[in-house]
């Protein structure tokens, strides 16, 4: 891939318009399909000015450690509902879409550099913990990967793509 | 003690332009944002815009963007929010406050513009 | 652009609990911040993140956000809660919001 393919906004746009649309189809997040298990996902909430005044190699930790446990969630997520009897055709679509989408963001990431950032020297503090939530529908795991995508992540591709600019 | 204070009262016509400070004290004027805050009589909060001293970054609310305009001086710890030509609709209170991850914690006192004819 | 709603008003009789809420679009996916406000004065901040205080806020003020909806909850009322109160959140964008504010009125 390009290394600054992921700068181009349309590119994550395409994205979390996916990850939008599977929320959409599950029905709202209160009566949607439910699942079996609850989910620890990436808590998304964002205080901005906190966001913006973290250094770029904090927000890539904090980046990786989302993508990471939302991939394991969604393939979770994937497994619970081949478990399940007559699973709806399109919400297997949609994880698999999403599934398709977090490789897709993982390497365009990895070409921009971003694993650079995760080599701390011994020294450095430990980054704190990834805040976490749980999920129980799979309407709020798609929202958890659309606000991932709209919050964190395009804010530190923003950060990573502007630097690289300058 | 964080303090921000602001310039003082402001009586001007339609068309006129103007330029109002805050200044920061107490604090490192470059380690947090400024923001503006509009409260039109008896009316609530609307929030204008932001601006980051150290980076100069600024960020408009959509409904100020190309109405006012926000700039900073951090050589004298002093943001500024300006009008080129003035309305009646821009009598408000405009509140200057330090945002941090604790957003808008330290407020100033506030400048009351009136623009009448 | 995000829009928060807010009652106009609410009254409370002194030593009960106030609740007063502010609903936005998926609001709870967002962090939510209370401002209190007396006539003639500037804004205090009262909640950030939710539910936290700022240090010299009484730990009669709580927050908490889920869903549509996030909640300021004044516990044993005093007449100098009366107040305008305002919610606001960050939008992923950058944008500050303030929903159009409540006025608390302390009943007696």
């Known amino acids: 891939a390009p290394p600054r393919l992921i700068c181009d906004s349309r590119v994550l746009e395409r994205y979390i318009l996916e990850a939008k649309e599977a929320e959409n189809v599950t029905m709202g997040c209160a009566e949607g399909p439910r699942l079996s298990e609850n989910i620890t996902v990436p808590d998304t909430k964002v205080n901005f000015y906190a966001w913006k005044r973290m250094e770029v190699e904090e927000q890539a930790i904090e980046v990786w450690q989302g993508l990471s446990l939302l991939s394991e969630a969604i393939l979770q997520a994937q497994a619970l509902l081949a478990n399940s009897s007559q699973p709806p055709e399109t919400l297997q679509l949609h994880i698999d879409k999403a599934i398709s989408g977090l490789r897709s963001l993982t390497s365009l990431l990895r070409v921009l550099g971003a694993q650079k950032e995760l080599m701390s020297p011994p020294d450095t503090t430990p980054p704190a913990p990834l805040r976490t939530l749980t999920v129980d529908t799979f309407c709020k795991l798609f929202r958890v990967y659309a606000n991932f995508l709209r919050g964190k992540l395009k804010l530190y591709t923003g950060e990573v793509c502007r630097r690289g600019d300058r | 003690e964080v303090q921000l204070v602001q310039s003082g009262a402001e009586v001007k016509k339609p068309g006129e332009s103007l330029k109002i400070s805050c200044k920061g004290s107490?604090?490192?004027?470059?380690?947090?944002?400024i923001g503006w805050v509009r409260q039109m009589p008896g009316k609530g909060l609307e929030w204008m815009g932001w601006?980051?001293?150290?980076?100069?970054?600024?960020r408009y609310s959509p409904s100020f963007q190309g109405q006012v305009t926000i700039s900073a001086d951090k050589s004298i710890s002093t943001a500024y929010l300006q009008w080129s030509s003035l309305k009646a609709s821009d009598t408000a209170m405009y509140y200057c406050?330090?945002?941090?991850?604790?957003?808008?914690?330290?407020w100033g006192q506030g400048t009351l513009v009136t623009v009448s004819s | 652009s995000y829009v928060l709603t807010q009652p106009p008003s609410v009254s409370v009789a002194p030593g009960k609990t106030a609740r007063i809420t502010c609903s936005g679009d998926?609001?709870?996916?967002?962090?939510a911040y209370w401002y209190q406000q007396k006539p003639g004065q500037a804004p205090v901040l009262v909640i950030y993140?939710?539910?936290k205080r700022p240090s010299g806020i009484p730990e009669r003020f709580s927050g908490s956000n889920s869903g549509n909806t996030a909640t300021l909850t004044i516990s044993r009322v005093e007449a100098g809660d009366e107040a305008d109160y305002y919610c606001?959140?960050?939008?992923?964008?950058?944008?500050?919001?303030f929903g159009g504010g409540t006025k608390l009125t302390v009943l007696g």
């Open positions: 406050a330090r945002v941090s991850s604790e957003p808008f914690d330290s």
């Open positions: 107490g604090y490192s004027f470059t380690s947090y944002w």
């Open positions: 601006i980051d001293p150290y980076r100069s970054e600024i």
């Open positions: 998926k609001l709870g996916d967002h962090y």
């Open positions: 993140d939710d539910s």
């Open positions: 606001a959140t960050w939008t992923f964008e950058g944008d500050y919001v």
